[in-house]
């Protein structure tokens, strides 16, 4: 067969679908690899061909579009399963071609099973809600295109195993779930089961997402440097190890990049010749406020090092702050007996 532009196996799009539920899978060629859409390709005389390789097999085979009740079908650039079976798991390829052009991409499809509480190997999207922020909503995800707007599905919401009914601050409103005032206790997995009719059959779609209640922007503050501070002086003798922690608290801010760095005499540690190591650790509160600690370490400090300026800097979307550490050379204790003897004129 003639050459085909092969985009390989697109593992970035690991598609997971539930067993015994409908699934619609768009050919990734038009979404991520080609600069034109299916309609343009179709009107230019290009044909979209689908085939697959079963799990643990090497053999590429055509997809059987003649199954009872059209269980698998193709519509434009979408491959439909109505519904999926466990053994539909495998690598699927869509190929766009005519006599002079060919382009193809493969992607993995995994059909997964869920338990009685909707737990499964499915990777879950995370939706962040601000704590005590007023009404916020989540929407049942990835159900577009399954049924026309004329069809009114029923939607049932669950938190973990339990149907959401008579919850104090969580109200199902069709495709949306409203949180009147989000609290830490609202953290968890939420599932919507969407039921809709199609061609004399009833189908169900199950979608689970994780809700994480995070710090509110109303309470967000610029970074706070807890250490170094004015109360601690790092007094060292030459030859000793100098350890200075920089501990910074960051309020949770959606999509904010939190940064902590040290400067020594106004330069980044990488830009100076002394032997400095910096170790970072990060911890999070229940609302995803972040505490970052960077420990600056000089194994054998010199008297020159003890004269330098050590400044901890921190930055978030809320602002930038800096704090200098108080570093000084320890004054050696007087050798008391000798000095006394000298004082009395002893030789």
């Amino acid at each position: 067969s003639e050459r085909c532009d092969d985009w390989g196996l697109d593992t970035m799009r690991q598609i997971q679908v539930f067993e015994d539920e409908p699934a619609r899978i768009k050919c990734p060629l038009f979404e991520h690899f080609l600069k034109f859409n299916y309609s343009t390709a179709h009107s230019a005389g290009l044909t979209l061909i689908w085939y697959w390789t079963r799990q643990d097999r090497d053999l590429e085979e055509p997809i059987n579009f003649r199954l009872p009740e059209n269980r698998i079908s193709k519509e434009k650039d979408v491959l439909w399963f109505r519904p999926t079976l466990l053994n539909d798991t495998g690598n699927y390829t869509c190929m766009l071609r005519n006599t002079t052009y060919c382009s193809k991409v493969a992607f993995p499809l995994e059909v997964v099973q869920k338990d009685s509480c909707f737990n499964s190997p499915m990777k879950l999207p995370v939706h962040k809600l601000y704590i005590e922020y007023g009404i916020q909503r989540i929407t049942c995800p990835n159900v577009d295109g399954y049924f026309p707007s004329s069809v009114k599905p029923t939607i049932t919401w669950y938190m973990g195993c339990y149907k959401i009914q008579n919850f104090n601050n969580v109200i199902p409103e069709g495709m949306n779930l409203s949180f009147l005032i989000a609290l830490i206790s609202n953290n968890g997995n939420y599932t919507c089961v969407v039921t809709y009719p199609e061609n004399g059959r009833t189908f169900h779609l199950t979608r689970t997402l994780t809700v994480k209640v995070v710090g509110s922007p109303k309470n967000a503050v610029p970074p706070v440097i807890h250490s170094p501070n004015d109360h601690v002086v790092y007094e060292k003798e030459p030859g000793e190890e100098l350890l200075i922690p920089c501990t910074v608290y960051f309020s949770f801010l959606m999509d904010s990049r939190n940064e902590v760095w040290w400067t020594i005499d106004g330069k980044k540690p990488d830009d100076i010749t002394i032997d400095v190591t910096i170790n970072e650790s990060i911890s999070h509160s229940r609302t995803e406020d972040e505490t970052r600690t960077q420990i600056l370490s000089i194994k054998k400090v010199t008297s020159e090092d003890l004269k330098r300026s050590y400044v901890c800097h921190a930055r978030s979307a809320k602002g930038e702050v800096a704090k200098a550490a108080k570093v000084k050379q320890k004054v050696p204790a007087p050798r008391y007996t000798v000095e006394l003897a000298c004082g009395f004129g002893a030789t």
Partner: antibody, heavy 118, light 107 residues
Framework: QVQLQQSGPELVKSGASVRISCKAS????????MNWVKQRPGKGLEWIGR????????NYNGKFKDKATLTADKSSSTAFMQLSSLTSEDSAVYFC???????????WGQGTTLTVSS | NIVMTQTPKFLPVAAEDRVIITCKAS??????VAWYQQKPGQSPKLLMY???NRYTGVPDRFTGSGSGTDFTFTISSVQVEDLAVYFC?????????FGAGTKLELK
């Protein structure tokens, strides 16, 4: 298409136990709940409980907690209900019925008639 | 347990009559009520769920309505094949409970 095929009628002595089966086909047995419902003439329908074959999780109607035991065998796509310490009150038609997490029953078995004799 | 009180118990009908069956829940069940039809010697068949949603394949002469505690099931024009027992069921909470049934019989 979905089918639930139940075992045949049973005539058993008072005090004994019985096991009724329900074989499912046409859908993913592991991924839906299987319910059991009792029907006595003039007594309407009573929900006994349900089992999720995928993980064996069960919910019972408190009234039947000590009477019925629900199990499932994924390899044969069959659900079972064992009824113990039988009395004449247990004489009834028993149905298995599927639900997809939603507590209403879209497919039913044909029913198994249990007669308890003294 | 939620008690579902269904009325009437018996309903004499003639072909093409409009039929209304009611079901009252002992507490609020939102709109989570299903309706079933059972013919002699057969298993029940799902007709409606979530009070007003017709199950696939169910003719549109069957409709349902209601929320909270009061629910109505209507057959707009009864056909001979509709002679059966009809049950309501709350699918709001466990234990699931049914109404006692309404038997449609010829006048």
């Amino acid at each position: 298409q979905v089918q639930l095929q139940q075992s045949g009628p049973e005539l058993v002595k008072s005090g004994a136990s019985v096991r009724i089966s329900c074989k499912a086909s046409g859908y993913a047995f592991s991924g839906s709940w299987m319910n059991w419902v009792k029907q006595r003439p003039g007594k309407g329908l009573e929900w006994i409980g349900r089992i999720y074959p995928g993980d064996g999780n069960t919910n019972y109607n408190g009234k039947f907690k000590d009477k019925a035991t629900l199990t499932a065998d994924k390899s044969s796509s069959t659900a079972f209900m064992q009824l113990s310490s039988l009395t004449s009150e247990d004489s009834a038609v028993y149905f298995c019925a599927r639900d997809y997490y939603l507590f209403y029953f879209d497919y039913w078995g044909q029913g198994t008639t249990l007669t308890v004799s003294s | 347990n939620i008690v579902m009180t269904q009325t009437p118990k018996f309903l004499p009908v003639a072909a093409e009559d409009r039929v209304i069956i009611t079901c009252k829940a002992s507490q609020d069940v939102s709109n989570e009520v299903a309706w079933y039809q059972q013919k002699p010697g057969q298993s029940p068949k799902l007709l409606m769920y979530y009070a007003s949603n017709r199950y696939t394949g169910v003719p549109d002469r069957f409709t349902g309505s209601g929320s909270g505690t009061d629910f109505t099931f209507t057959i707009s024009s009864v056909q001979v094949e509709d002679l059966a027992v009809y049950f309501c069921q709350q699918h709001y909470s466990s234990p699931l409970t049914f109404g006692a049934g309404t038997k449609l019989e010829l006048k």
